[in-house]
């Protein structure tokens, strides 16, 4: 039979409530009574699905009773007050607390009214990203590592890069029961072009307001890549002195530069100054192949450049001449 008034009393609660492992959480639950409706609440009850009995009861004469008194508390219900708020606080959340709970009001004249709430127990993961320093292998190897430690549920890790690469993701149980540690490796064939470039590890988790982005600066160890610059094929007798530069890219940094020629040591007109070679003015044509040999911890590489100083146009050209 329909109760008096215009509408029924309704229990209002969120369908899902998140809480953090080890923390406390409030399961909100309220009785909504329409304006024209009257109701009397004599008891509030919380029960967990799949378990016999109730975990918390607030009775209008007996007050609160709990299955685990140190972990549960009615936050608003008071003896002698109208029982409209059944919200229950749970302390020291455990993994096993996750599940479905029923909040129930015993009302007169309507009867009992209930709602189910899913309690989700989360653990916020700690995230780190680090470079995996590699050498040129010719094979795909892990070049960056991203770890999300102790998440519940497991975090989602993705990689963002314009270098290509493939992720390799694995999971192991976390230190705390019910948590998961996710490790993702970013795999690519190492090359010198990749050294110093960035890749981004993106970690997504229910507990984050927005994804966490961790940038990794890649490191590839490789021997020197050498070239010589400063010569324009246009050097003539009578021109100013010039400088050649031995350009070397390497990781780690070059430890030494050695200039020579195919014939052996440098001729007198060439003076080595580290990565640079000073070519002094000459008074007769030359045709010499210069060699720059660069060393780093991984080895030595060299570049050659054949330099000609020709008879030719007047000294308006850049080049080599006496002052």
């Amino acid at each position: 039979w329909p109760p008096p008034g215009t509408g029924d009393v309704v229990v209002q609660a969120p369908t899902q409530v998140p809480g953090f492992l080890g923390d406390s959480v409030t399961l909100p639950c309220y009785l909504q009574v329409p304006n024209m409706e009257v109701t009397h609440v004599s008891q509030l009850t919380w029960a967990r699905h799949g378990e016999s009995g109730s975990m918390a009861v607030f009775h209008q004469t007996q007050g609160p009773s709990y299955s685990e008194s140190k972990r549960l508390e009615f936050v608003a219900a008071r003896l002698g007050a109208e029982l409209r708020n059944a919200s229950l606080r749970m302390f020291g959340l455990r993994v096993e607390d996750e599940g479905n709970y029923t909040c129930l009001f015993v009302t007169f004249p309507q009867g009992s009214r209930s709602v189910d709430i899913w309690l989700r127990v989360l653990a916020k993961p700690q995230n780190t990203a680090e470079v995996q320093k590699v050498q040129l292998t010719g094979e795909p190897v892990p070049m960056a590592r991203c770890v999300s430690t102790g998440g519940r549920p497991p975090a989602q890790i993705t990689w963002h890069s314009d270098l290509g690469g493939m992720p390799n993701t694995s999971q192991v149980p976390g230190f705390l029961s019910g948590t998961v540690t996710v490790t993702s490796l970013w795999i690519l064939v190492p090359s010198s072009q990749v050294d110093g470039k960035n890749v981004t590890c993106k970690v997504e988790h229910e507990s984050f307001e927005k994804p966490q982005l961790l940038t990794v600066n890649l490191t590839v160890y490789y021997p020197p890549e050498v070239s010589i610059s400063g010569y324009d094929n246009n050097w003539y007798l009578g021109q100013n002195e010039a400088t050649l530069t031995c350009d070397a890219r390497s990781n780690p940094e070059p430890t030494g530069y050695n200039w020579s020629t195919t014939m052996g040591p440098l001729p007198p007109f060439a003076v080595a100054q580290g990565a640079q070679l000073l070519i002094r003015p000459v008074d007769k044509p030359i045709n010499t192949t210069l060699i720059c040999n660069v060393t780093n911890a991984l080895g030595a590489r060299q570049a050659e450049l054949t330099v000609q100083v020709k008879e030719g146009p007047p000294s308006e050209h850049s080049g080599i001449s006496r002052n």
């Epitope: 109760p3 008096p4 009257v38 109701t39 009397h40 004599s42 008891q43 009850t45 029960a47 009995g53 109730s54 009861v57 009775h59 209008q60 004469t61 009773s65 002698g80 029923t102 129930l104 015993v106 007169f108 004249p109 009867g111 009992s112 209930s114």
Partner: antibody, heavy 115, light 107 residues
Framework: EVKLQESGPELVKPGASVKISCKTS????????MHWVRQSHGESLEWIGG????????NYNQNFKGKATLTVDKSSSTAYMELRSLTSEDSAVYYC????????WGQGTSVTVSS | DIVMTQSQKFMSTSVGDRVSVTCKAS??????VAWYQQKPGQSPKALIY???YRYRGVPDRFTGSGSGTDFTLTISNVQSEDLADYFC?????????FGSGTKLEIK
Amino acid sequence: EVKLQESGPELVKPGASVKISCKTSGYTFTEYTMHWVRQSHGESLEWIGGIDPNNGGTNYNQNFKGKATLTVDKSSSTAYMELRSLTSEDSAVYYCAGVIPLEYWGQGTSVTVSS
Amino acid sequence: DIVMTQSQKFMSTSVGDRVSVTCKASQNVYTNVAWYQQKPGQSPKALIYSASYRYRGVPDRFTGSGSGTDFTLTISNVQSEDLADYFCQQYNSYPLAFGSGTKLEIK
């Protein structure tokens, strides 16, 4: 101490009506809903209905609709149940009981319907 | 309407024993079940509410359990003063319904 004091035994003729009272003390009358329960001789308990003294809201067992009427008098903290068109089947002990579930009980009123 | 069934009309026990009175609801009543004790010539007395919680002053030898449709009142270390009728009652929905009662007899 919460007390529910019911009126004395009644001997009534078939077809007549009777009004049983339940005077309460020891608590605020409007705080607890009041219910009425019938127990026929040697039988189980039967819920007749309940009333919220605060607003007069009632809920009746369909089996007793038209048979029982529940009222309250807030000024005297008393609940009443009127039974009408009595027959011999209505002979029973009638209890008033406060709160859900029924925590506080009156001592019972014996109603005998006999010609 | 919900029907509460107490299948044992009588139970015989001895002082010091443990006895369990059962009650079955015809549909889910959650934990909204109370147990009452009625001694001869007296009004019923509330023992248990919400299936498993004792009212203040009720000896802890009375224990209630169950939820959904199956409920039990257990009396451990039965005393002679426990001779009474025991009724279960659902208060999840109206009309409130009582079981037919179980009479506990002391040998």
